[in-house]
Amino acid sequence: IRLVPPYPSSQEDPIHIACMAPGNFPGANFTLYRGGQVVQLLQAPTDQRGVTFNLSGGSSKAPGGPFHCQYGVLGELNQSQLSDLSEPVNVSFPVPTW
């Protein structure tokens, strides 16, 4: 999980977060969490290992805490197998200087 450019400079700017699964799991389903709450879900195309979550401006006003990714794949008997949560990513904004 990582923040990708363009980086937000204020709480109104969009946030872009990339999440990647290991090589065994292209086409995985990804869930982005913030402070333990689901923010967005995306499925990678079958030929891709990751996704980029694009959060519209103001998303940073959602419940606080760092962002985490989790990916899931369908296993035997069509049961979803989930990864551990990723390392956290924190989004910070520059302090304005007047």
């Epitope: 990339a18 990647m20 290991p22 065994n24 292209p26 290992r49 990751g50």
Partner: antibody, heavy 116, light 107 residues
Framework: QMQLVQSGAEVKKPGASVKVSCKAS????????FSWVRQAPGLGLEWMGW????????KYEQKFQGRVTLTTDSSTNTAYMELRSLRSDDTAVYYC?????????WGQGTMVTVSS | DIQLTQSPSFLSASVGDRVTITCRAS??????LAWYQQKPGAAPKLLIY???TLQSGVPSRFSGSGSGTEFTLTISSLQPEDFATYYC?????????FGQGTRLEIK
């Protein structure tokens, strides 16, 4: 420690097939995919294909489609690459690699020479 | 398919120099880029993945940066053992293409 040990060098005639093996140790075999990469003498790295140890899915570079087959055997922790209809320009070192978030463990390479 | 172009193809430098190698992708690949080092007669070695994450055991003089279509590998102070060929690779979309390589030689 994590290790990939490949089978020995091969000399083949044009039109023949070759099957290279790659035995993994030091980690859980089914948690990581494999890719195969080749390098012709004096040239760069060329990705050939990928196989998931999770479900056996494969993806191949278009130029090798129909000529290469990747398989794995989780009972022996071994991955295989078979290349058919060999040509002289298939002469190269063939590497198996553990495919995680990148290619983090490489085999020592297997030299395949195609010559009449 | 995505194309990767490395520059320069050849680089001559001295021990202690700071060197930068660039890898450009023909379309956006997020931060899904890796860098490898290869010495003659040996298998490549992973240096950096996810554009900027240093692989365990790799000296901190190696660093990576970039996102989207432009990426760089920087060696802050060249050591004698760093003279080798360097490859970038995209891991965003299959096929998992490599750049053509940059040969780094002693000046």
């Amino acid at each position: 420690q994590m290790q990939l040990v490949q089978s020995g060098a091969e000399v083949k005639k044009p039109g023949a097939s070759v099957k290279v093996s790659c035995k993994a140790s030091g980690y859980t075999f089914t948690t990581h995919a494999f890719s195969w990469v080749r390098q012709a003498p004096g040239l760069g790295l060329e990705w050939m294909g990928w196989i998931s140890t999770y479900n056996g899915n494969t993806k191949y570079e278009q130029k090798f489609q129909g000529r290469v087959t990747l398989t794995t055997d989780s009972s022996t922790n071994t991955a295989y690459m078979e290349l058919r209809s060999l040509r002289s320009d298939d002469t190269a070192v063939y590497y198996c690699v553990r495919d995680s978030r990148a290619f983090d463990v490489w085999g020592q390479g297997t030299m395949v020479t195609v010559s009449s | 398919d995505i194309q990767l172009t490395q520059s320069p193809s050849f680089l001559s430098a001295s021990v202690g120099d700071r060197v930068t190698i660039t890898c450009r992708a023909s379309q956006g690949i997020n931060s899904y880029l890796a860098w490898y080092q290869q010495k003659p007669g040996a298998a490549p070695k992973l240096l950096i993945y996810a554009a900027s994450t240093l692989q365990s055991g790799v000296p901190s003089r190696f660093s990576g940066s970039g996102s989207g279509t432009e990426f760089t590998l920087t060696i802050s102070s060249l050591q004698p053992e760093d003279f080798a060929t360097y490859y970038c690779q995209q891991l965003n979309t299959y096929p998992l293409i490599f750049g053509q390589g940059t040969r780094l030689e002693i000046k």
